[in-house]
Every structure is written in C-alpha cells, then in structure tokens.
C-alpha cells in the first residue's frame, strides 16, 4: 500500500522536510503532489512525468518545493502555514491512480532565551533569587539546569509561570553556580547563556588553629606563637586580632616570637563580611609557663555570633 | 616602623625590561601582601598586581599579563617587579604599598615610588 | 573590571568651608571603598578604608559615607594643609581600580 512518510514529522520554521513516498506501484507513469488531504486542481504543487522527467508546478507551488523521480518532495525554508496535509497521486498505465496523505507540522523557531534575575548576590538565609527565562513564546516547553544538571528536588526550589520562572527560596551557599534556561518545542530546542549566581555568605563561626614552634603541645616562655584563623565566607572575610580587647593587625595569622608570661590572655579572631553585614569571632585563652608546666591552650575556647 | 624601600630611578629604552625592589622593614613580611601601583606623569593611580610573600602567589592585572613577572626574597624581605617589552607609556612613578590586612583591604603603607623613564 | 568615577575632577574651596567628593562604582561594592590623599610631590596615604572607617591619626574633620555603589568623602572644614588629590578605590578583590582623582584646592 502507497505510504507517505514526513521526515522530519515536526519542522521548525525555516527548515526543510522531506516527504517520501513508500510502495510506489510498479507501474507508474506519473506523480502529483497536492496540498491538503484530497485531490483537487486548485490545490495542485507540482506534477511530474516520468518518461520525459519533466515537473510542472500547479496553482499551489510557491518556488521553495522540488520533486524528485522517487516521487519524494522536498519543501524548503518552510512556514507555519505549510504545516498540515499532502496528498501524493500516482498516475499508473492502466489510469487506475493511488493516492496516499501524509502531514507534517511546522514550529516556529526558537529565539535563544536569555535569564533575569532579580538578584545575583543573595545573601544566603536572607535572600530569595528569582530567575526568569525570557522570552514568553507559546506552545513552548521551559527546562532549567544548574552547573549543567537538571534542576534537584528541592522544597526552596519552586517553578511557576509555566516553569519561565524559577524561584530559590531563602538561598544557600550551595546554590551558587551556573543557571541556563532552555526552550523546547517539538522540533527545536534553544539554551540561554549561564548566568552565575554568587551567593554571599559567612562569615562563619572562625577557628583558631595553633602552631607551635617548637612544635610541641605547650606553651613554654621562649617559644614562638603562630596562630591562624580560619572563617568560611564570601566574599572572604576581613581579619583582625585582639589581645586583651586592644587592637592588634588585621591579618590571617598571628605571630609572637618569643612568647613570655606577659603574653598570657585572651586572643580573639573577629571576622566581618561588608556584603553579607555579618561579623563573627573566637576568643582563646592562652597561658605561657616560665618553665617546666605546660598548659597550652585553655579549653574553654568560645565563640561569639554577631549579626 | 613599618618601612618600604623602593631601587632608584631607572632609564630604559622601548622593547627593554626593567626590575624594580622593594625592601619591607618593622613587621613580618610574609604576613602581608604587597601590591603595585603606577602613577604616569599627572595621571592618576594604576593597579598592577600584588604578590603573597608567603606562598608566592600572584595576581596580575589583565593589561600587564604577560608582561610583568612579582617575585619574592624571604631572605631579605624583598619583592621584585618586572615589567618587559617596554614604551613609551610605561614611563611612571612605581610604587609597592602593603595591604593593610589579609583579603579586601585597602594599601595602608607605600614605598617612596621609583621612576622609571621609557625613552630611546 | 569595576570602574570607578569620582567628581568633580577638581574643585576650589575657601579654608573652612565644607567639601565633597563622590565615587561611584559600576557595581555594587558593599562598602568596600578607600580614600587616599595624595600631596603634590608625595606618596599616596590612606585616610579611610570600609567606606567610613578612619584609620588612626588621620583629621576627624575627614570622613566617609555611601553604600553600594554611591559613596562621598567629606572635610568638614578644609584646611591650608588639605590641598591634594584624593582618590577612591575598591578594596573588593582584585583587580583593585581607582577613581581618576579629586584636585583639591585653596581659593
């Protein structure tokens, strides 16, 4: 039986497809090809001989169709007005023609979306960051990928307005990365550039690691303090020290050669971040034995959490 | 107190290099990064990148990459900065300047600046 | 890279009058702004640094304000001494960027 198979069966806009014609009778003379679902002369694209391979086109030939001697038509830089059904007749020697319909569905072609957003330095726990992926076109499908992924399941993750929006409730440091939209019909798909989202977070409780050198575990007079803290923020925290509460540098590491009695305190790490307006510190006590005794670092280190 | 002394004046001609010092004194050199600046004649005040003395890392403002080399001499407090290919528009005053802590501080202390002259 | 422009380039005041001198950024700066003073002939100093902090020994009669990308150095009532160019800059990572400088002078 006479078949019409559309390759592609969705076309985007300006594109072309292919229909071919499958089982063609042995004893054909001729091919015409019409728009619609019927044979009708108005509706007529273009008939072909084959004894003299010769194609005529018809009242609906619009220039952009090509008939081929395997009866397949080519239609070129098609429109959503091509889309719907064609009817391939093939004329046989003995005047009984076949005829078969196919159809094909034309989709307009996709803009490349681009994002939105509302905020792309949320500060975490504080923030929610809306992301819409622009523009609005119908009978379009919107996916979302992060760093390259498809979206988690997460409940602070919410999509609406026919998934062109995607909303990250009270983010965290973990959602930061890379977001693309992308837009998707039938037969075409287009992805936007990444849009980075920085999520600014900490400064958070900071620790306080010793180095002794020596390096053994107590706090001997004579021995040289290396204290380093450490906070985890973004952007990276300001450093700076307190020895019994007066000020002292604003650096990462504290050090003192040469470490006596004198030097026994509390020594606090504070840490601020201007973009998240968070402040944290740590305080520790340290004693420094004259001799033989070693206390090190007291215990009861503690911190204290500003906002 | 805090000092940062800077190599004198240099005169280069276009296509040459040129190496500038500069010597930190009164506090711990590895603790804190030291940038460098230029200031052409009556211009103002130009990033060019700064050095970790600790670590030896560095970060280069995108017009001098690939041109200026920071190093370092924890043996004697020194920072180095090398500019190569040199013309006419290098001619500046340099200046080292110590950030006045660790990460996104401002320049709190600054050598005395060496003026290097591009001129054939 | 984040721009930086000051105004007015230059100004003429009277010895203790008021004066201002903006900054603005091109992106959100979070505070993270300095000012220097540069005396004819001198090396750059630092006067305020985290947009409003003064470092120590610098005049009480300068001082900082602004948030985000907006910010202003002000003398409360210039003097003889104050005659200089005056920079800002971002201290949020790098690459740091400079204003093009404030001249300030004595009418």
């Known amino acids: 039986k006479l078949t019409i198979e559309s390759t592609p069966f969705n076309v985007a806009e300006g594109k072309e497809v292919l229909l071919l014609a499958h089982n063609l009778p042995q004893n054909r003379i001729g091919y015409s090809w019409y728009k619609g679902e019927r044979v009708d002369g108005n509706s007529l694209i273009v008939g072909y001989v084959i004894g003299t391979q010769q194609a005529t086109p018809g009242p609906a030939y619009s220039g952009r169709e090509t008939i081929y001697p395997n009866a397949s038509l080519l239609i070129q830089n098609v429109t959503q007005n091509d889309t719907g059904f064609y009817t391939l007749q093939v004329i046989k020697s003995d005047l009984v023609n076949e005829e078969a319909t196919g159809q094909f569905h034309v989709y307009p072609e996709l803009p490349k979306p681009s994002i939105s957003s509302n905020n792309s330095n949320p500060v975490e726990d504080k923030d929610a960051v809306a992301f819409t992926c622009e523009p609005e076109v119908q009978n379009t499908t919107y996916l979302w990928w992060v760093n390259g992924q498809s979206l988690p399941v997460s409940p602070r993750l919410q999509l609406s307005n026919g998934n062109m929006t995607l909303t990250l409730l009270s983010v965290k440091r973990n959602d930061a990365g890379s977001y693309e939209c992308e837009i998707q019909n039938p037969a075409s798909a287009n992805r936007s550039d990444p849009v980075t989202l920085n999520v600014l977070y900490g400064p958070d409780v900071p620790t306080i690691s010793p180095i002794i050198s020596p390096p053994d575990s107590s706090y001997l007079s004579g021995a040289n303090l290396n204290l380093s803290c450490h906070s985890a923020s973004n952007p990276s925290p300001q450093y700076s020290w307190r020895i019994n509460g007066i000020p002292q540098q604003h650096t990462q590491v504290l050090f003192i050669a040469k470490i006596t009695p004198n030097n026994n305190g509390t020594y606090a790490c504070f840490v601020s971040n201007l973009a998240t307006g968070r402040n944290n510190s740590i305080v520790k006590s340290i004693t420094v034995s004259a001799s033989g005794t070693s206390p090190g670092l007291s215990a009861g280190a503690h911190h204290h959490h500003h906002h | 107190q805090v000092q940062l002394v800077q190599s004198g004046a240099e005169v280069k001609k276009p296509g040459a290099s040129v190496k500038v010092s500069c010597k930190a004194s009164?506090?711990?050199?590895?603790?804190?990064?030291l940038h460098w600046v230029r200031q052409a004649p009556g211009q103002g005040l130009e990033w060019i990148g700064y050095i970790n003395p600790q670590t030896g890392y560095t970060s280069y403002a995108q017009k001098f990459q690939g041109r200026v080399t920071m190093t370092r001499d924890t043996s004697t407090s020194t920072v180095y900065m090398e500019l190569s290919s040199l013309r006419s528009e290098d001619t500046a005053v340099y200046y080292c300047a110590r950030e006045y802590g660790n990460y996104n501080y401002p320049l709190d202390y600054w050598g005395q600046g060496t003026l290097v002259t591009v001129s054939s | 890279d984040i721009q930086m422009t000051q105004s007015p380039s230059s100004l003429s005041a009277s010895v203790g009058d008021r004066v201002t001198i903006t900054c603005r950024a091109s992106?959100?700066?979070?505070?993270?702004l300095a000012w220097y003073q540069q005396k004819p002939g001198k090396v750059p100093k630092l006067l305020i640094y985290?947009?409003?902090n003064l470092v120590e020994g610098v005049p009480s009669r300068f001082s900082g304000s602004g948030s985000g990308t907006d910010f202003t150095l002000t003398i409360s009532s210039l003097q003889p001494e104050d005659v200089a160019t005056y920079y800002c800059q971002h201290h949020l990572g790098t690459p740091y960027t400079f204003g093009q400088g404030t001249k300030v002078e004595i009418k």
């Open positions: 992106e959100n700066q979070y505070g993270y």
């Open positions: 985290n947009f409003k």
């Open positions: 009164g506090y711990i050199f590895t603790s804190y990064w």
